[in-house]
């Protein structure tokens, strides 16, 4: 229903705390360089204005759209052009073009320093002094680094953060209480970020239909007892929620997500038997819980998929009558039978089925043509299954760090033109798939591995889009989202690449490396590994292992030496010489 004042409506629905949090996230995602204080001031002004509209919906400007209100606020910021360059040109446009312009200027890789966590004592002091400001800083810092972070979910992570601090800051050993818990939240939030970015990419590049297909597959796997009409309703609602968040309409998004959670909890009987635990929780926890609820038990009496989609006499008529509905029912029926497949794989199968009907239904004898379609799915299913087996075997053999290195070598050979920091980031993220997925039960591995890899590769594509340097990467990134992972997997050594010349300074290290945290040490070593591969793209695994073992030994020796600086300056050049010889 239409409301006289959109801002009053959202303020009333969301409540002051969530309203302010979402407005802060929105501003931080649009203007990523502004300080917390600048944004906090704007948020307060918007909140005060919303309250006047709640008191009187007919007050001046209360009838304006949220985009108009927020856009006007952003455009009133002093020194916009000096700080943001051509983004300031957006302010010359009218809505909705202005908002579209802001969206186009969101930066997936802003040049901001890594978000450093203060030490425990300092963190607890500032948290106790002003929990609201502390949480505001958290929302601001995460949102500006992740401009597509799913806003209502970020509120959930802030709430988690709050609970951890409340608990741990009361403990004697704050550090050992906080570190593992906050690390856990950080890891989950980073995964959430890349997954949501993938959803927004799907929406931006391929439209609502593509996202809705993803949602139908995912929901059908989770709720195999829900009928097609129920799944379609949930997929339509979920598509609307994600469209709003991806489009920067964060208040609407959070409000509609709350509505969807309410609907699901009121209709558990027709959706799933597994929702009750989630539905007993407060709003943010409830919505989060529903988004990752375990799969319901599959109905025991499902007929073979072939009955309706191959053997039925009216396959082509049903397809002709309503293509999207027929393909949707195929995706639904196939997905509910296969919680053990990735959504990407299910969408590839649906695409194959669609292509088969397009071809076969135009022939004189369609049934003879499409009769083998399910058998033709086999190679499509085997490929990701083999990928999972090979990679999990390798992970189990090498451990996470070794597995990341193996991936780093592989991907540097596939796309040596890509910048080393991007390759290292991608390989580290791709390598985490082992820890995340390979320890799961067999039937959960494939969906975990492939859907996670797809999300990470989407980030690789986004970063590469900014500065395209590799034809291999461009080729894989310009295809459909579901084909990207198989495309990257199939890439081999880039034969067109002219190896980098060997520069001694690239492999020269100093004693400061010894005091770095383990993660930073690993990144330094992985940076060197990528540079070695760029120098010798066809180096064997054995050669690279020899060099990396030597390198690790060198670091270990010099970091234990009494005079570290002398050790690095005398042993370093010897290491460089040995490396050159080993790779010759």
């Amino acid at each position: 229903e239409a409301h006289k004042s959109e801002i009053a409506h959202r303020y009333n629905d969301l409540g002051e705390q969530h309203f302010k949090g979402l407005v802060l996230i929105a501003f931080s995602q649009y203007l990523q360089k502004c300080s917390y204080d600048e944004h906090a001031k704007l948020v307060q002004e918007v909140t005060d204005f919303a309250k006047t509209c709640v008191a009187d919906e007919s007050a001046a400007n209360c009838d304006k759209s949220l985009h108009t209100l927020f856009g006007d606020k952003l455009c009133a910021i002093p020194n916009l052009r000096e700080n943001y360059g051509e983004l300031a040109d957006c302010c010359t446009k009218q809505e909705p073009e202005r908002n579209e312009c802001f969206l186009q200027h969101k930066d997936d890789n802003p040049s901001l320093p890594p978000f450093e966590r203060p030490e425990a004592e300092a963190m607890c002091t500032s948290f106790k002094e002003n929990p609201t400001t502390f949480m505001g800083h958290y929302l601001h810092e995460v949102a500006r680094r992740h401009p597509y972070f799913y806003a209502p979910e970020l509120l959930y992570y802030a709430e988690q953060y709050n609970e951890i601090l409340t608990q741990c800051c009361a403990e004697a050993d704050k550090e050992s209480c906080l570190t593992p818990k906050l690390d856990g939240v950080k890891e989950k939030a980073l995964v959430s970020s890349v997954r949501q970015r993938m959803k927004c990419s799907s929406m931006q590049k391929f439209g609502e239909r593509a996202f809705k297909a993803w949602a139908v597959a995912r929901l059908s796997q989770t709720f195999p007892n829900a009928d097609f009409a129920e799944i379609t309703k949930l997929a339509t609602d979920l598509t609307k929620v994600n469209k709003e968040c991806c489009h920067g309409d964060l208040l609407e998004c959070a409000d509609d997500r709350a509505e969807l959670a309410k609907y699901m909890c009121e209709n558990q009987a027709t959706i799933s038997s597994k929702l009750q635990t989630c539905c007993d929780k407060p709003l943010l926890k409830k919505a989060h819980c529903l988004s990752e609820v375990e799969h319901d038990t599959m109905p025991a009496d499902l007929p073979a998929i072939a009955a309706d989609f191959v053997e039925d006499q009216e396959v082509c008529k049903n397809y002709a009558e309503a293509k999207d509905v027929f393909l949707g029912t195929f995706l639904y029926e196939y997905s509910r039978r296969h919680p053990d497949y990735s959504v990407s794989l299910l969408l590839r199968l649906a695409k194959k089925y669609e292509a088969t009907l397009e071809k076969c239904c135009a022939e004189a004898n369609p049934p003879a043509c499409y009769g083998t379609v399910l058998a033709e799915f086999q190679p499509l299913v085997e490929e990701p299954k083999n990928l999972v087996k090979t990679n999990c075997d390798l992970y189990e053999k090498l451990g996470e760090y070794g597995f990341q290195n193996a991936i780093l070598v592989r991907y540097t050979q596939k796309a040596p033109q890509v910048s080393t920091p991007t390759l290292v980031e991608a390989a580290r993220n791709l390598g985490r798939v082992g820890t995340k997925c390979c320890t799961l039960p067999e039937d959960q591995r494939l969906p975990c591995v492939e859907d996670y890899l797809s999300a990470i590769l989407n980030r690789v594509c986004l970063l590469h889009e900014k500065t395209p340097v590799s034809e291999h990467v461009t080729k894989c990134c310009s295809g459909s989202l579901v084909e990207r992972r198989p495309c990257f997997s199939a890439l081999t050594v880039d034969e067109t690449y002219v190896p980098k010349e060997f520069k001694a300074e690239t492999f020269t290290f100093h004693s400061d490396i010894c005091t770095l945290p383990e993660k930073e040490k690993q990144i330094k070593k992985q940076t060197a590994l990528a540079e070695l591969v760029k120098h010798k793209p066809k180096a064997t695994a054995e050669q690279l292992k020899t060099v990396m073992d030597d390198f690790a030994q060198f670091l270990d020796t010099c970091c234990k030496a009494a005079d570290k600086d002398t050790c690095f300056s005398t042993e370093g050049p010897n290491l460089v010489t040995r490396c050159k010889d080993a790779l010759a």
Epitope: Q313, E314, V315, C316, K317, Y319, A320, E321, E358, C360, C361, A362, E363, A364, N365, P366, P367, A368
Partner: nanobody, 115 residues
């Protein structure tokens, strides 16, 4: 909504000819193979002939081969069945179907061959 409407049936003497038409709507006609099937009184459905979406490929049952010809006009969204040298055993209700289906989803047109 897919609609198929057959016409052209009637009473005809053995040895004579008839031309059946099927007007199609509600879908991209040229993207789908089409068929004619028939049902004689008291019998099951029998496949008669099929044609590809482009009209380049046709298939015809042995029982009518050399006598019946299937064709289509994609610009008019219409399927045809030219029936020559009709026999008493060709008496049936004729239906057009999408994609080789042996399921009636239209009214059909009655062809009676009798002297």
């Amino acid at each position: 909504k897919v609609q198929l409407v057959e016409s052209g049936g009637g009473l005809v003497q053995p040895g004579n000819s008839l031309r059946l038409s099927c007007a199609a709507s509600g879908f991209t006609f040229s993207s789908f193979g089409m068929s004619w099937v028939r049902q004689a009184p008291g019998k099951g459905l029998e496949w008669v002939s099929s044609i590809s979406g482009s009209g380049s490929d046709t298939l015809t049952a042995d029982s009518v081969k050399g006598r019946f010809t299937i064709s289509r006009d994609n610009s008019k969204n219409t399927l045809y069945l030219q029936m020559n040298s009709l026999r008493a055993e060709d008496t049936a209700v004729y239906y057009c179907t999408i994609g080789g289906s042996l399921v009636r989803s239209s009214q059909g047109t009655l062809v009676t061959v009798s002297s």
